[in-house]
């Protein structure tokens, strides 16, 4: 399916609005520090050029690849060396090395100020004054902070953002209408970004075989009535889409995603009974809906797997003939029977089955060797079941904030070398698993919890890769994608860690504490808790609880005082001294 001009092809397929949005996202994800106006200028230039190619595909440069065109455009930025340092060296390379170089310089934790939400009236005025610029600014600000955000999905978020302002800026109580919608978009956006980051890490660090295995398991759970061939086709197409988006090929990715949605809607009968309501929606909403669609009901009478995967005399023959196909079918058959298992557990089971066949098919009596293979699965299944049970009990007992604190202590003891902001961010997010998953029925708890934890732990891995400080983190992150969570769960107190020297400055607080939001106060307290554990890794739960209770009381007292700053100055050192004594 070759075209004389790739840029013209994509412009025609996507339409001007989506084309411009995706190019803006691509540029913002590559050059994360560039000002908005600079990106808008570049996007307009690319769009004008694309239009000339639509008019005449033989026009000069229209035959160039998108990477060449976009890379050339990015390399025209005047301040590249000053702003990005060594990233400017990418411009000396030829494609495809230049694009790979840009990808390697994407920053998962860019030094950008947190987005401050203006007053509702200010936002509504900006929306009405120039809707197009307002929405472009949204795409730019999200994309530069989330350089792996799934681009076609970001267009969907932007459409919802637009709809929220269009509706709420007309409302009697603008704030009551708008703010909950913006909160929801922010939270969903962060979750979407983190999920996509795991997909990209899976592809980039472990290869497309790892991603395909994940996709077979997940799609087989979603579409248990679909044939293996159908699931395989969807997996192949989905892998192409995500490979493109993770590789910065956002126009191709969005185009292929639209094709996949079209295919699924044209073939609902052989995929799932749950697709109907998605398929009536417009493109962006349709693709989102299909990605989030609930699992179809399992067929009524699925037989046990023993006959084909243990009892058959042809197991080793079938395995040897086409290993990945045979393992893929095993994973498909297992996953469609177990929507109650996490994808990561299903992948561990497939890995265990593969290891058994590798060993047994070379043995004197293969059948005798692998006859009990399914019995070996039981501990693998029970480990996450028990983990979810124990942690949900702890969450129900403590509530979210104290559950997060328990995880902060647990993870700081495991990997105390990791920076305090990273430990706070990751542990707070790990703690959100309780509210997200523990209220669900038994059959949905494990897939919710373990697959969510995989996403959060990937964030730890991504941040740690940028600044490696712990061999244990590196080991858990790089050895096996599917065993990351069990690897972290198994870590104990780091006995080799030399406790951090006490620094009174770390535990000095001021009156500004009193004006913080509840969330910001929690983060301050949790930052102090991590620092305490780094100072005294062997402190008991009771000791830490005592110090934290005293901290809360001290802050509450000073925030009620007439002269707050004087109170913090006087009571702060007392709190520090009492804490040191309590932890001695």
């Amino acid at each position: 399916d070759t075209h004389k001009s790739e840029v013209a092809h994509r412009f025609k397929d996507l339409g001007e609005e989506h084309f411009k949005g995706l190019v803006l996202v691509a540029f913002s994800q590559y050059l994360q520090q560039c000002p908005f106006e600079e990106h808008v200028k570049l996007v307009n230039e690319v769009t004008e050029f694309a239009k000339t190619c639509v008019a005449d595909e033989s026009a000069e440069n229209c035959d160039k690849s998108l990477h060449t065109l976009f890379g050339d455009k990015l390399c025209t930025v005047a301040t590249l060396r000053e702003t990005y340092g060594e990233m400017a060296d990418c411009c000396a390379k030829q494609e495809p090395e230049r694009n790979e170089c840009f990808l390697q310089h994407k920053d998962d934790n860019p030094n950008l100020p947190p987005l401050v939400r203006p007053e509702v009236d200010v936002m509504c005025t900006a929306f009405h004054d120039n809707e197009a610029t307002f929405l472009k600014k949204y795409l730019y600000e999200v994309a530069r902070r989330h350089p792996y955000f799934y681009a076609p999905e970001l267009l969907f978020f932007a459409a919802r953002y637009k709809a929220a302002f269009a509706e709420c800026c007309q409302a009697a109580d603008k704030a009551a209408c708008l703010l909950p919608k913006l909160d929801e978009l922010r939270d969903e956006g962060k979750a979407s970004s983190a999920k996509q980051r795991l997909k990209c890490a899976s592809l980039q660090k472990f290869g497309d075989r790892a991603f395909k295995a994940w996709a077979v398991a997940r799609l087989s759970q979603k579409f248990p009535k679909a044939e293996f061939a159908e699931v395989s086709k969807l997996v192949t197409d989905l892998t192409k889409v995500h490979t493109e988006c993770c590789h910065g090929d956002l126009l191709e990715c969005a185009d292929d995603r639209a094709d996949l949605a079209k295919y699924m809607c044209e073939n609902q009968d052989s995929i799932s009974s749950k697709l109907k309501e998605c398929c009536d929606k417009p493109l962006l909403e349709k693709s989102h809906c299909l990605a989030e669609v609930e699992n179809d009901e399992m067929p009524a009478d699925l037989p046990s797997l023993a006959a084909d995967y243990v009892e058959s005399k042809d197991v080793c023959k079938n395995y040897a003939e086409a290993k990945d196909v045979f393992l893929g079918m095993f994973l498909y058959e297992y996953a469609r029977r177990h929507p109650d298992y996490s994808v990561m557990l299903l992948l561990r089971l497939a890995k265990a089955y593969e290891a058994t066949l590798e060993k047994c098919c070379a043995a004197a009596d293969p059948h005798e060797c692998y006859a009990k293979v399914f019995d070996e699965f039981q501990p693998l299944v029970e480990e996450p079941q028990n983990l979810v049970k124990q942690n949900c009990e702890l969450f129900e007992q403590l509530g979210e904030y104290k559950f997060q604190n328990a995880l902060l202590v647990r993870y700081t003891k495991k990997v105390p070398q990791v920076s305090t902001p990273t430990l706070v961010e990751v542990s707070r997010n790990l703690g959100k698993v309780g509210a997200k998953c523990c209220k669900l029925p038994e059959a949905k708890r494990m897939p919710c919890a373990e697959d969510y934890l995989s996403v959060v732990l990937n964030r730890l891995c991504v941040l740690h890769e940028k600044t490696p400080v712990s061999e244990k983190v590196t080991k858990c992150c790089t050895e096996s994608l599917v065993n990351r969570r069990p690897c972290f769960s198994a870590l104990e107190l780091d006995e080799a860690y030399v406790p951090k020297a006490f620094n009174a400055e770390t535990f000095t607080f001021h009156a500004d504490m009193c004006t913080l939001s509840e969330k910001e106060k929690q983060v301050k307290k949790q930052t102090a808790l991590v620092e305490l554990v780094k100072h005294k890794p062997k402190a008991t739960k009771e000791q830490l609880k005592g110090v934290m209770d005293n901290f809360a009381a001290f802050v509450e007292k000073c925030c009620k005082a007439d002269d707050k700053e004087a109170c913090f100055a006087e009571e702060g050192p007392k709190f520090v001294a009492a804490s040191q004594a309590a932890l001695a």
Partner: nanobody
Amino acid sequence: QVQLQESGGGLVQPGGSLRLSCVASGSIWGIYHMGWYRQAPGKQRELVASITVDGSTHYADTVKGRFTISKDNAANMVYLQMNALEPEDTAVYYCDIRNVGGDYWGQGTQVTVSS
């Protein structure tokens, strides 16, 4: 060794009700399917009702609206509530529990619907 034991069968008049129970003893983990099948004299064994791990239920057309299948995961038990019984429901009813490693059957319990 896994064993299934059905109970609750018996003789009942047309229009009456029975509740069948089935309990699994022994270690069975990873159950994905629990079902009730029946076999009338001289006929093939047929699926009456099944319930899967995701809570989906499936009923034979002849029993829809009259029979209800339910389960207790913690106790590895499956039930069949049978209302508005008809003479055609007379059969031996078998309980079936499946995990990926095997398909486990009970010995059956006789249900007779007769006036």
